[in-house]
């Protein structure tokens, strides 16, 4: 969490951002909130990016003002116009690119004063893994697949019954480059699976951590997956 304060002649206002991560090829949110004003026409929102000459986005007098927007963000940004009045200056970024990573500044002017806060935005690829019994195998085997990751993640297997066990000798992980030549498909196979056990396939890079769990009994399986973004720090 980053909280910034204005230092102009007018009163300073509190602006708060949250470090976040964008999934390349998808839409992302750069989060920013501020002390609201009662008049929309008195609010100015400017998003800037370190190392970029033009603006990322500007919103003033109740509408977008994009005449000074940098080319790299053309047609890809939007604020939540109906939420600005309640202090939401978050920016929606369409079709996130690897090059969108960096330090952003959310700069706010209202009738109460000015304020700004920085935000670290990471970009990469992350996806939910699916674990299944691998029915192509001769012995009981689990296969964990996740379609899109970048940078290359680590994959670790764990089990509820054999807590702390190292499965690296009985697993095999491969990374296959996807067609856009950036993200990769992750496939990990675990051998010598025992029944009445729950196994977890954990995939992690510096942006996200995802886990696919599968409960294996003699008569059925049950799976669930979850994903968490790392380093979501507020400023």
């Amino acid at each position: 969490l980053i909280i910034g304060f204005g230092i102009s002649g007018r009163h300073s206002i509190t602006v708060t951002t949250v470090a976040s991560a964008g999934n390349i090829g998808e839409d992302g949110i750069l989060s920013c909130t501020f002390e609201p004003d009662i008049k929309l026409s008195d609010i100015v929102i400017q998003w800037l990016k370190e190392g970029v000459l033009g603006l990322v986005h500007e919103f003033k007098e109740g509408k977008d003002e994009l005449s000074e927007q940098d080319e790299m963000f053309r047609g890809r940004t939007a604020v939540f116009a109906d939420q600005v009045i309640v202090g939401n200056a978050s920016l929606r970024l369409k079709n996130v690119q690897l090059t969108d990573a960096g330090t952003y500044k959310c700069y706010i002017i209202t009738s109460k004063g000015k304020g700004n806060a920085n935000l670290e935005y990471k970009t990469g690829a992350f996806s939910m893994p699916e674990v299944n019994v691998d029915y192509n195998a001769s012995s009981e085997t689990l296969r964990c697949e996740a379609p899109r990751w970048f940078p290359q993640p680590t994959v670790v297997w764990a089990s509820q019954v054999d807590q702390g066990a190292n499965f690296s000798e009985v697993s095999n992980t491969s990374f296959e480059l996807n067609s856009e030549n950036v993200t990769m498909k992750v496939v990990s196979v675990l051998y010598n699976v025992t029944i009445n056990n729950t196994y977890s396939c954990m995939i992690e890079n510096d942006i996200a951590k995802a886990t696919g769990d599968i409960k294996v009994t003699e008569s059925e399986i049950k799976r669930r997956s979850h994903l968490q973004l790392l380093n979501s720090k507020a400023s």
Partner: antibody
């Protein structure tokens, strides 16, 4: 007495969506997964997916992923199946069933007819 | 996906006959489950975990098998047994059913 009561028959045009409900009673709704299965006229059974009512976690048959959406409303003990972009091949009886244990429970089925 | 092939697809038998339905999976699935369905009705769980009879299922029914090959047997067919029987696996996603075996009166 455990019961799963489904909504009534539907007739839809190709490209439309349908939402079928399944109201559970007689047991703790959040303790058992709900499965959805369909059966085309004169055909066999086809598994669509499952949902855990305790946290709405879902697993889908890849064939239906993106077209089928499973949801629950815990306040009314009701599970829902929504199927979008309907085509004539989706004409079938849709069943909800409770997680299979020594006794299984099924809804009475909902006939969805897709016709122009 | 694991494919399940039942045989025969249909059979005609008389009351008192011994009837055997087989189900073959494209991969080892450890356990099989069986359903009975009558026309216009929802399926009913009939045999679970290969050989355990569901609540209320008569003892003339039995199930056996392992790996990829499983069998449902009716030792002495009764009038109420005329129905369609489906095998089912929940050992690999997506869960799948056999195409069904229709048991008809001769």
């Amino acid at each position: 007495e455990v019961q799963l009561v489904q909504s009534g028959a539907e007739v839809k045009k190709p490209g439309a969506s349908v939402k079928v409900s399944c109201k559970a009673s007689g047991y703790t709704f959040t303790n058992f997964w709900i499965h959805w299965v369909r059966q085309a006229p004169g055909q066999g059974l086809e598994w669509i997916g499952e949902i855990d009512p305790s946290d709405s976690y879902t697993n889908y048959n890849q064939k239906f992923k993106g077209r089928a959406t499973l949801t629950v409303d815990k306040s009314s003990n009701t599970a829902y199946l929504e199927l979008s972009s309907l085509r004539s091949e989706d004409t079938a009886v849709y069943y909800c069933s409770r997680e299979i244990t020594t006794v299984d429970y099924w809804g009475q089925g909902t006939l969805v007819t897709v016709s122009s | 996906d694991i494919q399940m092939t039942q045989s025969p697809s249909s059979l005609s038998a008389s009351v008192g006959d011994r009837v055997t339905i087989t189900c073959s999976a494209t991969s080892s699935i450890s356990y099989m489950h069986w359903y009975q369905q009558k026309p216009g009705k929802a399926p009913k769980g009939w045999i679970y975990d290969t050989s355990k009879l569901a609540h209320g299922v008569p003892s003339r029914f039995s199930g056996s098998g392992s790996g990829t090959d499983f069998t449902l047997t009716i030792s002495s067919l009764q009038p109420e047994d005329f129905a369609t029987y489906y095998c089912h696996q929940r050992r690999s996603y997506p869960f799948t059913f056999g195409q069904g075996t229709k048991v008809e009166i001769k």
